[in-house]
Structure formats: structure tokens, C-alpha cells
Interface confidence: medium
């Protein structure tokens, strides 16, 4: 027998697709020879419209390749994520989202500032928009705190009417008794524990109103509570130590000139809260006329020496030890200016002379039965003592 060895047909010489190369490179490819295609960085293998993890073709007996040549298509990172309270600009070209394209995130001016990075992102070879620091998630637009239309520095007693934008952090809390609070970031409210204690297991019953100047106005931004956090050290009906609470809102609120968070005190804040330094309390509580205020009122009051305040509340009907190190006092020795029933939970704010931003130094807590009484002072929760507690809750929830 003669065995005829038919030399198998060599396969057509493969041509690497644009932006790709083949391996191994041979003079010719015969039966069972194979080659792979690799794409340059920023390009991905596609067969038709389907992405491939890898590609290898085998030369068949009849001189044909077992599969068609793929293409190397430029990586497309797709439309970048929206930035809440910000926007994205295409730098490379309109709607260009392919490899090496550049986009620039920015935050809405005045009321938001960018956290994490400079907002410049590049479409990388792995298909992700990536910042210069290597972050894949978009930046965060954080509300600017402590902005007020006021340039100088119910329990508002002997006060004056607030104007739009004066106290944009002021929050009206309804649902139990009327109380107040102060907006932190764009989804937290700082208030007094005693003001919302009854609602601690029923956050949804709290009706939270922002951006209002009048207590009864229909023009406000409605917010609802998702959760209430009362300080563990607060004991209801046993004094006012640790009279602080946080309310988490179920949605972020839109920041504008009428709704802006208050800043938390920096470590250096105590230098702006010494005896006789002026703080400002605001609220809808009882006024000198004995009515709950219709308009948001405010009063500028000096910080009172802690020992003097402690002594003022050691006489009956108060019990010794009422004023603790977690409290600060403010008011005039002659009386006439104070916070009062209905103002509880509101912020006593101070201007940080270095940053020119307002920060919360105290929370309206308690005081004499007769607001604005001579020789008695308004007592406020000393916020700086609770910064770790506040930050812990906000970062964990």
C-alpha cells in the first residue's frame, strides 16, 4: 500500500486587528497551529458585540481558522455616575467616555464643597472612571456649614425677628411638644434629648420642618425622621446632664440660602466661647408677651462664668449639682434676654473668627421657670464635650 500524505493546507496568514497584536508570530500556520490575540491597554476583545476574556484560533485540516478574527475595541467607561448636588463636565469632548477620556466633577457653588479629591477622573483601561488618587467612586459634595446672611454676631425672650437666611440651620420639630433643632450636614438634626425623649421609639411621628421663618407658615421644607439617637448618659426626669440627641433624616435635604447646616465646633472653638463672649440663640419659644413666637426670633447673649452659673442654681427650688461640666450658661445678670419654653433643642451659635463660619456651641436645654429672670441664666448643653459621640453616631449610621 502506498500511503499518500496529503500535506495539509496552511491557514491564511492572520492579520492582527487594529490596536491588537498576535502571538506567536510564525512564518506560516499549519494544522493544529494556533495564535492568540491580545489588545493594547485601553482596548478589549470583541467578537461581534460580545466581549471576550481571551481569544485563540486553531488552524484546521481544511486550511481554515476555527473562528473569525476578533476586534480590539476601545474601552468605554460609560456615562459617569451623577454627582448629587454637583455636576460632571466632559473635558475630552462632548459625551466622550472612552479610554483616556477626562471628566471633571464639580459641586454646586456656594453651598457645597468637594470632599475626597479634586474631581478630575480619567477613563482607565479597566473600564472604570478613576481619580488621580486611584478612587473609583465619585467624589462627594458636602454641604458648606455655618453660612448665614447675618454678619454680626418658645426660649427666645427679649429677642428680635430673624430675617431670611439668618439662621438657615434652624429646624422646627413638631410631633410631641414644639421643639427646635439644628441641621448638621444634610441629613442629621442636633437637638436636646429632653425635647424628643417621648418620640425615641417612634421616630416617624416627628414632623421636621426646615427653611421656615414662621412657625405656622405653609412655606417650609418637610423632612421626616428615620431614627432618633438619645445620649446614653441622659436620664429623663433626673436633671439635664447629657441633654443631647441626634435625629437622622430619611432623606438628604437640598441646601440653599434658607437651609444650611451649622458647623460643629473645631478643637480651637473654646477660644470663641469664653466668659462674656457673645452667642446667639434662636427659636419660636415663648416671648416676653407670653405667646409662642410666630416668627423665628433670636437673641445675642454673653457666656456666663461657670461658677457663677452653678451658684445661681444651687438655691431652692433647684438642687445642688444641677449645673454640670457638660453645660454652659448664657444670659444677662440683669435678666431680660433668654431662651424659653418652646426653644428647647435649638442651637446657641458662635462665630468662628478664623473661618468666619458659625458653629454650634450649645443646645438650648433648661433654665429658670421665669425666663429672662435676673440672676438666673439659660443653661445649654456644651456641644464640644460631645464631638466624639456625634461623630461616632454619624459615621456608623
Amino acid at each position: 500500500h502506498h500511503h499518500h500524505h496529503h500535506a495539509s493546507q496552511p491557514c491564511p496568514y492572520p492579520m492582527a486587528p487594529p490596536n491588537g497584536h498576535l502571538s506567536p508570530v510564525q512564518a506560516k500556520y499549519i494544522l493544529k497551529d494556533s495564535f492568540s490575540i491580545f489588545c493594547e491597554p485601553g482596548y478589549e476583545l470583541l467578537q461581534g458585540h460580545l466581549p471576550l476574556k481571551s481569544f485563540a484560533a486553531v488552524c484546521q485540516k481544511d486550511g481554515s481558522w476555527d473562528q473569525p478574527m476578533p476586534s480590539c475595541s476601545i474601552v468605554d467607561c460609560g456615562p459617569p455616575d451623577d454627582l448629587p448636588s454637583g455636576r460632571v463636565e466632559y473635558i475630552t469632548g462632548p459625551e466622550v467616555t472612552t479610554y483616556k477620556a477626562v471628566i471633571q466633577y464639580s459641586c454646586e457653588e456656594t453651598f457645597y464643597t468637594m470632599k475626597v479629591n479634586d474631581g478630575k477622573y480619567v477613563c482607565e483601561a479597566d473600564g472604570f472612571w478613576t481619580s488621580s488618587k486611584g478612587e473609583r467612586s465619585p467624589p462627594v459634595c458636602e454641604p458648606v456649614c455655618g453660612l448665614s446672611a447675618r454678619t454680626t454676631g418658645g426660649r427666645i425672650y427679649g429677642g428680635q425677628k430673624a430675617k431670611p437666611g439668618d439662621f438657615p440651620w434652624q429646624v422646627l420639630i413638631l410631633g410631641g411638644s414644639t421643639a427646635a433643632g439644628a441641621l448638621l450636614y444634610d441629613n442629621w438634626v442636633l437637638t436636646a434629648a429632653h425635647a424628643i425623649y417621648e418620640q425615641k421609639h417612634d421616630a416617624s411621628s416627628l414632623d421636621i420642618r426646615l427653611g421656615a421663618l414662621k412657625r405656622l407658615s405653609p412655606h417650609y421644607t418637610q423632612a421626616w425622621a428615620e431614627a432618633v439617637f438619645i445620649h446614653e448618659g441622659y436620664t429623663h426626669d433626673a436633671g439635664f446632664d447629657n441633654d443631647i440627641a441626634l435625629i437622622k433624616l430619611n432623606n438628604k435635604v437640598v441646601i440653599n440660602s434658607n437651609i444650611t447646616p451649622i458647623c460643629l465646633p473645631r478643637k480651637e472653638a473654646e477660644s470663641f466661647m469664653r466668659t462674656d463672649d457673645i452667642g446667639t440663640a434662636s427659636g419660636w419659644g415663648l416671648t416676653q408677651r407670653g405667646l409662642l413666637a410666630r416668627n423665628l426670633m433670636y437673641v445675642d447673649i454673653p457666656i456666663v462664668d461657670h461658677q457663677k452659673c452653678t451658684a445661681a442654681y444651687e438655691k431652692p427650688p433647684y438642687s445642688g449639682g444641677s449645673v454640670t461640666a457638660n453645660m454652659l450658661c448664657a444670659g444677662l445678670e440683669s435678666g431680660g434676654k433668654d431662651s424659653c419654653r418652646g426653644d428647647a433643642g435649638g442651637a446657641l451659635v458662635f462665630l468662628d473668627n478664623e473661618t468666619q463660619r458659625w458653629f454650634v456651641g450649645g443646645i438650648v436645654s433648661w433654665g429658670s421657670m421665669n425666663c429672662g429672670e435676673a440672676g438666673q441664666y439659660g443653661v445649654y448643653t456644651k456641644v464640644i464635650n460631645y464631638i466624639p459621640w456625634i461623630k461616632n453616631i454619624i459615621s456608623n449610621f
Epitope: 411621628s205 414662621k214 405656622l216 407658615s217 405667646l291 410666630r294
Partner: antibody, heavy 123, light 107 residues
Framework: QVQLQQSGPQLLRPGASVKISCKAS????????IHWVKQRPGQGLEWIGM????????GLNQKFRDKATLTVDKSSSTAYMHLNSPTSEDSAVYYC????????????????WGQGTSVTVSS | NIVMTQSPKSMSMSVGERVTLSCKAS??????VSWYQQKPEQSPKLLIY???NRYTGVPDRFTGSGSATDFTLTISSVQAEDLADYHC?????????FGAGTKLELK
């Protein structure tokens, strides 16, 4: 004593607008929001809107946005409601009422009501 | 808008009987509910505010109760002068809304 005195009944042709008045006495007019409420014969009450006499801030039920305009005249302690292009659907008794105060606290309820103004729209 | 549903639509009672009127809100309105009495050809009169607070001069046979979505007006011993329509209303959110009313008649 507290009183809200409303203007008399009105018989109108369709499309002829009307202004109802509500004169307040016996209390500080600028301290209370004034509400307007509609009641069709044999039916319930329907809130139209409210106005703060101190600065004329208004809050309107969206349903009445194109129908009612609320104004006040502080000098005469009078609130007004202007009904635009009335139709038979607007035939009703319209009440003004004040937002109440009790023991120094606003009570989020209407504590005094006018006697009502009957508006009949008929061709 | 919050819908306030009153029941029953009407009821016939004898003098001295205890009457319970119901008002249900379509969503939580806290205690921001008022009750008004309206006699024929008269304007409404405030009876109860804040769900349970009796307004000045209102006889103590009228009692309001409830919170969130379920509210009740109770007349402990109905008198002839109590024959009227009773309206509940919420002032928790705008627009303010009222129920369709309950008509109280004498047997």
C-alpha cells in the same frame, strides 16, 4: 369679643368674579392667620387657603390656585377672598376662620369662624 | 393630600346615650386633629384641638382621643342641643383637609 363679620350673599352670573370680605374685631388681627373654607350644600368642609395679615404671606390649596386670591387690609382689619371666573361648581358657602391661640399657644385649629357668605353662580 | 374618613355618615341617638364618632387619617398625622360641631344654618364651632384638648367653654361630655391615624370623638351623654354635623380635620400637613362629616340625629 372675637368676631369675624363676613359680607352678604352673592348671586352671580358665570364668569363674573366676586370678592368676599371678612372683618375682624375683638382681637389682634395681625397675630392670627386667617383661613378660608368652602362648603357646598350638604357636603363637608374644604380648605381653600390661609393668609398671614402681618405680612400677607399666603398658603393656597393647589386645587384653588387659579380660583382664589387672598388679600388683607391691615388698616381695616379685613381679609378678602377674590373668586376668579366662577362657575356653578363654585356655588357654596365660604367661611373665614382664624387660627386659634389657647393659653398662649397656637393650637393649629380654627377657633373662631365667620357666619359664612353664600355664593350662588347661576345663568 | 391626607384623606380624612369619618364614620358613620349619620347616626340616630336618644338623649342620654353615649356616642362615639370615628375619624381615620390616610397617613400619620400625630395629634394634629381637631373636631368641629356645625348646627344647621350655622358656622362650625371648635370642640377639640390637638386630638384630645377640649376648647374653652366646651362641655366636658365631649372627649377627643387618638393619635397617628385613628381618632375618636365621644359624647358621654348626648343632649338635644348636640344634634349637628361633626367634622374632623387635620392640620399636620398642607393642604389642611377635613372629613365628610357625621350627622347626629335624634331618634
Amino acid at each position: 369679643q372675637v368676631q369675624l363679620q363676613q359680607s352678604g350673599p352673592q348671586l352671580l352670573r358665570p364668569g363674573a368674579s366676586v370678592k368676599i370680605s371678612c372683618k375682624a374685631s375683638g382681637f389682634s388681627f395681625t397675630n392670627h392667620w386667617i383661613h378660608w373654607v368652602k362648603q357646598r350644600p350638604g357636603q363637608g368642609l374644604e380648605w381653600i387657603g390661609m393668609i398671614d395679615p402681618s405680612d400677607s404671606e399666603t398658603g393656597l390649596n393647589q386645587k384653588f390656585r387659579d380660583k382664589a386670591t387672598l388679600t388683607v387690609d391691615k388698616s381695616s382689619s379685613t381679609a378678602y377672598m377674590h373668586l376668579n371666573s366662577p362657575t356653578s361648581e363654585d356655588s357654596a358657602v365660604y367661611y373665614c376662620a382664624r387660627l386659634g391661640i389657647h393659653d398662649g399657644y397656637y393650637i393649629y385649629a380654627m377657633d373662631f369662624w365667620g357666619q359664612g357668605t353664600s355664593v350662588t353662580v347661576s345663568s | 393630600n391626607i384623606v380624612m374618613t369619618q364614620s358613620p355618615k349619620s347616626m340616630s341617638m336618644s338623649v342620654g346615650e353615649r356616642v362615639t364618632l370615628s375619624c381615620k387619617a390616610s397617613e400619620n398625622v400625630g395629634t394634629y386633629v381637631s373636631w368641629y360641631q356645625q348646627k344647621p344654618e350655622q358656622s362650625p364651632k371648635l370642640l377639640i384641638y390637638g386630638a384630645s384638648n377640649r376648647y374653652t367653654g366646651v362641655p366636658d361630655r365631649f372627649t377627643g382621643s387618638g393619635s397617628a391615624t385613628d381618632f375618636t370623638l365621644t359624647i358621654s351623654s348626648v343632649q338635644a342641643e348636640d344634634l349637628a354635623d361633626y367634622h374632623c380635620g387635620q392640620s399636620y400637613s398642607y393642604p389642611l383637609t377635613f372629613g365628610a362629616g357625621t350627622k347626629l340625629e335624634l331618634k
